[in-house]
Interface confidence: low
Amino acid sequence: WELTILHTNDVHSRLEQTSEDSSKCVNASRCMGGVARLFTKVQQIRRAEPNVLLLDAGDQYQGTIWFTVYKGAEVAHFMNALRYDAMALGNHEFDNGVEGLIEPLLKEAKFPILSANIKAKGPLASQISGLYLPYKVLPVGDEVVGIVGYTSKETPFLSNPGTNLVFEDEITALQPEVDKLKTLNVNKIIALGHSGFETDKLIAQKVRGVDVVVGGHSNTFLYTGNPPSKEVPAGKYPFIVTSDDGRKVPVVQAYAFGKYLGYLKIEFDERGNVISSHGNPILLNSSIPEDPSIKADINKWRIKLDNYSTQELGKTIVYLDGSSQSCRFRECNMGNLICDAMINNNLRHADEMFWNHVSMCILNGGGIRSPIDERNNGTITWENLAAVLPFGGTFDLVQLKGSTLKKAFEHSVHRYGQSTGEFLQVGGIHVVYDLSRKPGDRVVKLDVLCTKCRVPSYDPLKMDEIYKVILPNFLANGGDGFQMIKDELLRHDSGDQDINVVSTYISKMKVIYPAVEGRIK
């Protein structure tokens, strides 16, 4: 019996087609992805093949103005339209709190939403009961397939799930659910979840009875043969893991941003054992037409976005200096504003030991593309912020050793004075450079804001300590020459859309007046 698994993950609000790098579509003939194009391909496969499941491995939320405006209603609407069969909860599904998940998505989705390792407690338990499930048994043709969900146990550090959801260890939580499915005579089981490729592989290895793992979170691109676009494969598709009980378990992921549709064909024997698996992600490029009906729906929903982008978010009473001549040479108040917003967006998980789990931000000055003039009545709009941060990136959370941070700050000024983009703006960091010294030895003082303290203060950076830092995904991926970050990072979790982070902060503060205050000397 053959099953076709179509899968997406980390779509992050890319409802409309995008450019090849998943930013805003400029030249439509070269654009990719989007739900209208995805629908065309899915329907084509559904017609051609008898047993098809369309699955999403989480993080539909967060990433473009679509999420900012519609807050998840757009996810439910268009996933319903595409007739997804199941979705696993990702960490970003909690970005607007549990209410922001329940109302727009859990209550509106016409497909099961899954996570076996999230347990509700207290008053939330009854409110959320039945709205997401640990597993779901789906009829596919004349057979039955069990789908069991999982979500990153780091979610409390990455999003806003509140205090009434407990995120258990994935493997510990999955095993009893898989065992339960087995007792129900369900012998074909897919683990669908959002914990990253390393955890996906562990699940394949450790959870008895899981036949296939469909993952997300790490934006992993797997491919067999010559890849069709810019993404470099992290391994073959499917990636085969040998389980502890000797089975060959295929593990798949489909990069991110709806650029590819994962396509995996699995052959099962009559006892539900995987006999063979093969496939590849399908690049959703312009050779695949956009479905006109879905496209028309997208255009209808778009109208509200255009209106939103000109509305006032808040006011500034000072000039927001985002000029190249400032931000690529010295501390600039636009850099301070953005870093403050980045830290504010990550205020979570305080306890009696820590006032926050992260206190530091770095931001490449070249990523700041425009100032905002306060003389326009002080008004700040989404449109203004889109000019400052036009690349559609995210502000991510990484863990780095102090020694890596030191290298990053040396790189920041290794060719100082040429208006290059790598000059770092900061938050929760005090850095002193001596530009008379030779490149690679210019950082003379580097103090960082403590997190394990009741009164935050600046302490000297320790080379062997592990620090959490918020930074643009561009830097986490080694952009502007920050190869040491990419090579040496110990953990990387994707964060929220850059403009959204800043706009939320401005809306919260209402009136802003960021200063140049001696963070960089």
């Epitope: 329907q43 559904r46 017609r47 319903n80 339209a81 007739r83 997804y84 069969d85 199941a86 989705a109 016409k110 497909f111 099961p112 779901k136 048994v137 789906l138 009829p139 043709g141 004349d142 039955v144 129900l184 005579n185 479905d291 009906s293």
Partner: antibody, heavy 121, light 107 residues
């Protein structure tokens, strides 16, 4: 409110075809499957097939394969069921019924009022 | 194809009675089962789906149970408006067959 309104009764000769319409209102027509079910006098219900209006994808019960054709006109939110090569045992009330167009919870939640088709020489 | 067998085919009961109708599938339908009520000359009306979930607007005296191949519809206290014919339907694999029906009449 959400409703399905079917065309009127038909009398047909054996060997002829009949086309019954089902006009939807009060909801987004393209978001739900339309199914056809028939019921001979004093008998039970018999599922015939379904269509997903957004793209015209159909699935028919094997028993009716080759004789039944389900179509839609989305511009007027109407589904059609055509049954050909009619015989006397096709005399029945034919219902259209709306189904959620997604896996998860499956059921027919809204039904048309029924169309009586009589096949008689 | 999965066949659905309902029992009894007819049943006489009084107002206030507790009534149980069963539906047996020839194969496991994994709770993908709906119950409908039909009155003479009318279209069927959805009562329950997923074997036990009450449809919107249906009185709580109706309940469903079961799993695998055996399912039950229970009316805890019959009301005059409940006298009708009841059908089960599975949504496992096509064709989505109905049971033969149970006619519930006033004793």
């Amino acid at each position: 409110q959400v409703q399905l309104v079917q065309s009127g009764a038909e009398v047909k000769k054996p060997g002829a075809s009949v086309k019954v319409s089902c006009k939807a209102s009060g909801y987004t027509f393209t978001s739900y499957d339309i199914n056809w079910v028939r019921q001979a006098t004093g008998q039970g219900l018999e599922w015939m097939g379904w269509i997903y209006p957004r793209d015209g994808f159909t699935k028919y019960a094997q028993k009716f394969q080759g004789r039944v054709t389900i179509t839609v006109n989305t511009s007027i939110s109407t589904a059609y069921m055509e049954l050909s090569s009619l015989r006397s045992e096709d005399t029945a009330v034919y219902y259209c019924a709306r189904k959620e167009g997604y896996r998860g919870d499956w059921y027919f939640d809204v039904w048309g009022q029924g169309t009586t088709v009589t096949v008689s020489s | 194809d999965i066949q659905m067998t309902q029992s009894p085919s007819s049943l006489s009961a009084s107002v206030g009675d507790r009534v149980t109708i069963t539906c047996r599938a020839s194969g496991n339908v994994h709770n993908y089962l709906a119950w409908y009520q039909q009155k003479p000359g009318k279209a069927p009306k959805l009562l329950l789906y997923n074997a036990k979930t009450l449809a919107s607007g249906v009185p709580s005296r109706f309940s469903g149970s079961g799993s695998g191949t055996d399912y039950t519809l229970t009316i805890s206290s019959l009301q005059p408006e409940d006298f009708a014919t009841y059908y089960c339907q599975h949504f496992w694999s096509t064709p989505w067959t109905f049971g033969g029906g149970t006619e519930l009449e006033i004793k």
